[in-house]
Interface confidence: medium
């Protein structure tokens, strides 16, 4: 029974996106009155793990010595004090990379593009996948999903940009995944440097569908325009 206690804070070190085989530590921070910490994993009978608090009792450590597919998923934690159990923490989504071979990322017609023109980033996988993710380095909200509908699987996804501005310049990587578990991603593609030349600065591009993002103006996700190239794919903004 959730009580009036404030919810704890849940985070992962070194981060929530972990390569297969690497170690990760999940931390749950509550209050100094905490007597016990509990970690729950979605789709797993609770509790997933229990730990006694570390001095000075306001947090607990849950260790995963070697990241595997089993540990990927959504977690919440609680703490118990003399007056009862806290509210649940906000969820932590632990994502594993390295579940599939790396895709190839390329730019069409070229990674060198003139401002105001168009470019398409193409993410290709060796085997058919139904989710592709494009990441731009140093973006606060870097993930753009192209996800197939009805289980249709593709060998590639296209991320068109038009018109290109200087904001689009930077380093990109892509991942592929299966829709049944967006907590399991491929190895990252090799990086692709998109270079935008020309001093003409057009208006910021806007997506074909309305996008809500908490990022600042320089940290918004890549915003492609035009029709989705594969009818079976649809955009998901995160």
């Amino acid at each position: 029974q959730a009580g009036p206690l404030p919810k704890p804070t849940l985070w992962a070190e070194p981060g929530s996106v972990i390569s297969w085989g690497n170690s990760v530590t999940i931390w749950c921070q509550g209050t100094l009155e905490a007597r016990e910490y509990r970690l729950d994993k979605e789709e797993s009978p609770a509790p997933w793990d229990r730990q006694n608090p570390l001095e000075p009792k306001n947090k607990a450590r849950f260790s995963i010595p070697s990241m595997t597919e089993d540990y990927a998923g959504r977690y919440r934690c609680y703490y118990r004090s003399p007056v009862g159990w806290s509210q649940p923490s906000d969820p932590l989504e632990l994502v594993m990379t390295g579940a599939y071979s790396k895709p190839t990322l390329s730019a069409l017609p070229s990674p060198l593009v003139t401002s105001g023109k168009s470019v398409t980033l193409l993410c290709q996988s060796r085997s058919p996948m139904d989710t592709f993710l494009l990441i731009k380095e140093r973006a606060a909200h870097p993930l753009l999903h192209l996800r197939s509908e009805h289980g249709a699987q593709q060998h590639q996804a296209e991320f068109p940009m038009s018109p290109v501005t200087s904001v689009h310049g930077g380093t990109y990587r892509c991942f592929s995944s299966h829709g049944f578990s967006h907590y399991l991603l491929s190895h990252p593609s090799d990086p692709l440097e998109l270079i935008v030349s020309g001093s003409l600065e057009g208006p910021r591009p806007s997506p074909t569908r309305s996008v809500s993002t908490a990022a600042g103006p320089e940290d918004q996700p890549l915003m492609p325009t035009g029709s989705v190239p594969h009818s079976g794919l649809r955009r998901h903004w995160e």
């Epitope: 997933w48 070697s66 089993d70 085997s127 049944f180 907590y183």
Partner: antibody, heavy 123, light 107 residues
Framework: QIQLQESGPGLVNPSKTLSLTCTVS????????WSWIRQPPGKGLEWIGY???????NYNPSLKSRVTISVDTSKNHFSLKLSSVTAADTAVYYC?????????????????WGQGTTVTVSS | DIQMTQSPSSLSASVGDRVTITCRAS??????LAWYQQKPGKVPKLLIY???TLQSGVPSRFSGSGSGTDFTLTISSLQPEDVATYYC?????????FGQGTKLEIK
């Protein structure tokens, strides 16, 4: 209905390499863990190792220096190689499938097994 | 490595009896535990996964419980066809160790 079938020589000479293949029929090899397990005569089950369809592997530490598990998704099979075998490696060898990615509905047990193949190490 | 210890190593019970087999992990494994049944000369069969989830097609007289380090497989009413060796197995991380097995016989 997915089925697994082990194949390989039933007799291996000491110090040689044991090679077995598990063919997966009636289903995809993708998105599952694929394991090898063995059972010496009159003894319990021993987990040898697993491979995920990505090629990620984990092995039993007691066998790690001698074991290689590989997968060929195009042929829908995975394989076991155990080097420098001795009489202690005589056993029934099973291949098995484990669900086990997040959200799979069976993220645990090995729900499909091959019939097993008996391997004898002897000269 | 985490060790899995089953008890008892063998037991004899009468048809209709309630039978309990326990499995203890040397460290906590949450609910990453499966139970298997192996009848003489046959392939192991999955009974329970995630400590307490009954595999499809397994009779409801089988049940599993536990989390962390202590787990139990229960047969609510023993039947003649339940004669077998039962194994627990952990799979939270490699190695996916099996218990040594519990041989169940009918009195």
């Amino acid at each position: 209905q997915i089925q697994l079938q082990e194949s390989g020589p039933g007799l291996v000479n000491p110090s040689k390499t044991l090679s077995l293949t598990c063919t997966v029929s009636g289903g995809s090899i993708r998105s599952y863990f694929w394991s090898w397990i063995r059972q010496p005569p009159g003894k319990g089950l021993e987990w040898i190792g697993y491979i995920y369809d990505s090629g990620n592997t984990n092995y039993n530490p007691s066998l790690k220096s001698r074991v290689t598990i590989s997968v060929d998704t195009s042929k829908n099979h995975f394989s076991l190689k155990l080097s420098s075998v001795t009489a202690a490696d005589t056993a029934v060898y099973y291949c098995a499938r484990r669900g086990g990615y997040y959200g799979s509905g069976n993220y645990g047990g090995m729900d499909v097994w091959g019939q097993g193949t008996t391997v004898t190490v002897s000269s | 490595d985490i060790q899995m210890t089953q008890s008892p190593s063998s037991l004899s019970a009468s048809v209709g009896d309630r039978v309990t087999i326990t499995c203890r992990a040397s460290q906590g494994i949450s609910n990453y535990l499966a139970w298997y049944q192996q009848k003489p000369g046959k392939v192991p069969k999955l009974l329970i996964y995630a400590a307490s989830t009954l595999q499809s097609g397994v009779p409801s007289r089988f049940s599993g419980s536990g989390s962390g380090t202590d787990f139990t497989l229960t047969i609510s009413s023993l039947q003649p066809e339940d004669v077998a060796t039962y194994y627990c197995q952990k799979y939270n991380s490699a190695p996916w160790t099996f218990g040594q097995g519990t041989k169940l016989e009918i009195k």
